[in-house]
């Protein structure tokens, strides 16, 4: 049967019927329902929500909806022994203590089981010592401290402001610098937008608000005790000493009221420049230690959290494909939250729920997609992408053979300014074409397309008249699908104006104030941005699952490969003498990119011309498109990061959230001037160029005529 025979809705109306069925009011109701109590991973409340979603997805009409459970390492504060930080005097007396909880928002005063702010997976400990302020605790911040300012963090407690990079990278950097503890805080410069009130009167962070979050450095491993394999009933678990990615020093987060008390006493060196100063009324001195009268006072951390193997539950829904049931298009987003999850994740989960309902409505009317659609409600994303990774580990053989695409669906909004898309280049044309067909929800763009408002507000830095689409990094559930398995992936959400709002993320991220009311009052009262995101995510899934020829354009990969090759070459050319000395050449990489470009062009011509009524040829061409992303996977992985296997993209070694292109070469070149053995270091650069060139060439050959 052709896909048209699998439906009683005419093909022209398929997508329209699906999109028209999506309703803002439903998303609003679902968001309300999902945010009334906390849904922390590993808790009974989150298990109950999993069962509710399972039941509702069945009602919506999916063919099957199952729970997939795993027993993974999670982390919780000790209920009877709270975490806090003190300033102690020379006698050891605590003269100041940080707060033990966030003041609850109005209407939530009597809610139980609000987990207090903590850094998940922090080891226990009570270190005391002098404080050093390390700005954002980025690699370059520690370079500034150690190499330029000659400040030694060894044996110190460091205080770092949240923002710019993933908190796990901050902790890793502090550990490498020899720190014995880390205090993370939210500075108003990054989490308080000028001219906006604090919650509950606006969307800014109040002084008592604190960002929770995990501080792991998993590098794609999933459950720290079962890297590479599912944490099932018969799993062999590593001992805690061998667990992947756990921090070795105590870490704790605080709000800016408490941070003020610590930072106002700082002595030592003045900050190096304006980029180290936040918005508190403190000097932002770096230290080490307190100034003058306070120089005998120290900081002491009291951390008593515990790591526990705990059961988590994914919800996996299936809508079987009519023509190619063995080809999977996956829409997944997480369900677990730190507290209420008003934005993260439930603004995304509510959108997924409505997408499932719409697909279910079409199915009840007799329609089926061409390919199978899998819907996932992931657990324990906040604890290191654990639910999605364990499920993918369990199903890796199926996924690597059958996975067409993965669309991520975490927070639908982080602002209400314009669209933000990160995806594989294979999806660029799909996203462009889809957004040209959707209406913009933006004020001043009535009657205009989403593509038009997006392009106007977020223009591509390279191509005029086109919108910015970013590289995929990590920090969300697409990681295992894209970085490990090589399944074409994408994500979309509404975002802030990055030009005018310099704070990191959104101010109330991972705080108790991320409530339904935050969204309904301040971000999206009409839920029109949520609806638009539902249309983008759902529209992408629809096209990927239903189009006869997969909506991937391999020529867009050719374009970015050339751009990335130019970029990495220019980085290397900052060392012309060494390149000459060690005979470093990028010729092989540029040659491979050239071959890829030519072969991709010829493939695209064949794609226009082939007989689409021949199911064997159609399947063959679609398989070449599906497996192209897979061809960029190196089975050996990146150096010291075996679960990051994509040669073109990986999460930055310095910021998990950011994507890096040609990461193997990039990391080999990074800080190469400081390496003790230049010959060995440049040898590794050459090896990484070889790996990249081979991989690009091998990928190109998958697009060649098969015989």
């Amino acid at each position: 049967k052709s896909s048209n025979e699998a439906t009683n809705i005419t093909p022209k109306h398929n997508m329209k019927a699906f999109l028209d069925e999506l309703k803002a009011e439903n998303i609003k109701k679902f968001l309300y329902n999902f945010t009334q109590i906390p849904h922390l991973a590993g808790t009974e409340q989150n298990f109950q929500l999993a069962k509710q979603i399972q039941s509702q997805w069945k009602e919506f009409g999916l063919d099957s909806v199952e729970l997939a459970h795993y027993d993974v390492l999670l982390s919780y504060p000790n209920k009877t022994h709270p975490n806090y930080i003190s300033i102690i005097n020379e006698d050891g007396n605590e003269i100041f203590n940080t707060s033990l909880f966030e003041p609850p928002p109005p209407g939530y005063e009597n809610v139980s089981d609000i987990v207090p702010p903590f850094s998940a997976f922090s080891p226990q400990g009570m270190p005391e010592g002098d404080l050093v302020y390390v700005n954002y605790a980025r690699t370059e911040d520690f370079f500034k401290l150690e190499r330029d300012m000659k400040i030694n963090c060894s044996g110190k407690i460091v205080i770092a402001r949240y923002g710019k990079v993933f908190r796990g990278n901050k902790v890793k950097n502090a550990q490498l610098a020899g720190a014995k503890g880390v205090i993370l805080y939210s500075d108003p410069a990054d989490y308080f937008a000028p001219g906006v009130k604090s919650y509950p009167d606006g969307w800014n962070l109040p002084g008592g608000g604190v960002q929770r979050g995990n501080i792991l450095n998993l590098n794609g491993a999933g459950d720290p005790l079962t890297p590479g394999y599912p944490a099932n009933e018969y799993a062999y678990r590593r001992g805690i000493a061998e667990a992947v990615g756990l921090p070795s020093i105590p870490v704790h987060p605080i709000g800016y009221y408490d941070a003020q008390k610590l930072l106002e006493k700082m002595g030592g060196s003045a900050p190096p420049d304006s980029s180290w100063r936040g918005s508190l009324k403190v000097p932002y001195n770096v230290g080490p230690g307190f100034t003058g009268n306070f120089s005998t006072q120290k900081v002491k951390m009291h951390i008593h959290s515990t790591n526990e193997v705990t059961r988590i539950y994914n919800v996996i829904g299936t809508l079987r494909g009519a023509v190619e049931p063995d080809r999977y298009v996956i829409l997944g987003g997480h369900r677990d939250s730190w507290v209420f999850g008003g934005i993260d994740p439930q603004s995304g989960a509510a959108v997924v729920h409505e997408i499932v309902r719409s697909f279910g409505t079409l199915k009840k009317e007799g329609w089926r997609p061409r390919r199978t659609i899998l819907f996932a409600s992931w657990d324990a994303e906040e604890f290191g992408l654990l639910g999605s990774t364990e499920w993918a580990e369990e199903n890796s053989r199926l996924l690597q053979e059958r996975g067409v695409a993965y669309i991520n669906a975490d927070s639908s909004i982080e602002g209400n300014y314009t669209l933000r898309v990160d995806c594989t280049p294979l999806m660029y044309s799909l996203v462009h074409n889809l957004t040209k067909e959707l209406k913009s929800p933006d004020e001043g763009f009535e009657g205009k397309s989403l593509y038009e408002s997006w392009t106007k507000k977020s223009p591509s830095p390279e191509f005029s008249g086109m919108p910015r689409i970013s590289k995929l990094g990590s920090g969300n559930d697409f990681e295992v699908f894209f970085q490990r398995l090589g399944i074409a992936s994408g994500r979309a959400r509404y975002t802030k104006n990055w030009e005018t709002n310099k704070f990191s993320g959104y101010p109330l991220y991972h705080s108790v104030y991320e409530t339904y009311e935050l969204v309904e009052k301040f971000y999206d009262p009409m839920f029109k941005y949520h609806l638009t995101v539902a249309q983008v995510r759902g529209g992408m899934v629809f096209e990927l699952a239903n189009s006869i020829v997969l909506p991937f354009d391999c020529r867009d990969y050719a374009v970015v490969l050339r751009k990335y090759a130019d970029k990495i070459y220019s980085i290397s050319m900052k060392h012309p003498q060494e390149m000459k000395t060690y005979s470093v050449s990028f010729d092989s990489l540029f040659s491979a990119v050239k071959n890829f470009t030519e072969i991709a062009s010829k493939f695209s011509e064949r794609l226009q011309d082939f007989d689409k009524s021949n199911p064997i040829v159609l399947r063959m061409m679609n398989d070449q498109l599906m497996f192209l992303e897979r061809a960029f996977i190196d089975p050996l992985g990146l150096p010291d990061r075996p679960f990051y296997r994509h040669v073109i993209y990986a999460p930055s070694s310095h910021n998990k959230y950011a994507g890096e292109s040609f990461p193997g070469i990039y990391d080999a070149l990074f800080d190469i001037e400081s390496k003790v053995d230049p010959s060995k270091a440049w040898g590794e650069v050459k090896r990484q160029i070889y790996v990249a060139a081979f991989t690009v060439q091998a990928a190109a050959e998958t697009l060649s005529e098969v015989a």
Partner: antibody, heavy 115, light 107 residues
Framework: EVQLVQSGAEVKKPGASVKVSCKTS????????IHWVRQAPGQSLEWMGN????????TYNQKFQGRVTITVDKSTSTAYMELSSLRSEDTAVYYC????????WGQGTLVTVSS | DIVMTQSPDSLAVSLGERATLSCRAS??????VDWYQQKPDQSPKLLIY???TRHTGVPDRFTGSGSGTDFTLTISSLQAEDVAVYFC?????????FGAGTKVEIK
């Protein structure tokens, strides 16, 4: 070997501006703070401001009331100091120095302000 | 602004003898103090940073000490090449400020 090479001496009229350059070599340019310091004839040293070449973050001595601008060109590993609305008391030797602790110094540039 | 007061203004010491230079800050600066040497018609050179750490290549006859408001640079055995003006500088707060200098001569 770390080297900071400054541009040559300048003679300026009051009210004019001067831009002094400082070309660095022998180290990773983005790694060290660049400071500008001046020394009037027979006098002590006076700190004018600094810049982080990695991100362009600056701090200035408020005494110069917005008259001083420090910039960098990463592509040439060069720092610049521009002083505007010159007056006779700005006559001095202007030094660039690399490193938070002024680890390495340029040779100095004499700027003479005279009508 | 923090005022750095150096004393004495000048100091004459016999070759091989000890020279002790003082620098006082108008408020507590912790150990955020550097010492520089400037020879006639030359750029200054860094000697001591963080009050007591010798910069690379600086002879061990130069020693820095002190914290809070009182700092000392000691030249344990004066050599002919040590004739110069010595400046202290604080970097505990902006603007960074220098002392007026101590001129060291041979007696």
């Amino acid at each position: 070997e770390v080297q900071l090479v400054q541009s040559g001496a300048e003679v300026k009229k009051p009210g004019a501006s001067v831009k002094v350059s400082c070309k660095t070599s022998g180290y990773t340019f983005t790694e060290y703070t660049i400071h500008w310091v001046r020394q009037a004839p027979g006098q002590s040293l006076e700190w004018m401001g600094n810049i982080n070449p990695n991100n362009g973050g600056t701090t200035y001595n408020q005494k110069f009331q917005g008259r001083v601008t420090i910039t960098v060109d990463k592509s040439t590993s060069t720092a610049y100091m521009e002083l505007s609305s010159l007056r006779s008391e700005d006559t001095a030797v202007y030094y660039c120095a690399a490193g938070w602790n002024f680890d390495y110094w340029g040779q100095g540039t004499l700027v003479t302000v005279s009508s | 602004d923090i005022v750095m007061t150096q004393s004495p203004d000048s100091l004459a010491v016999s070759l091989g003898e000890r020279a002790t230079l003082s620098c006082r800050a108008s408020q507590d600066v912790g150990t955020a103090v550097d010492w520089y040497q400037q020879k006639p018609d030359q750029s200054p050179k860094l000697l001591i940073y963080w009050a007591s750490t010798r910069h690379t290549g600086v002879p061990d006859r130069f020693t820095g000490s002190g914290s809070g408001t009182d700092f000392t640079l000691t030249i344990s055995s004066l050599q002919a090449e040590d004739v110069a003006v010595y400046f202290c500088q604080q970097y505990n707060s902006y603007p960074r400020t220098f002392g007026a200098g101590t001129k060291v001569e041979i007696k």
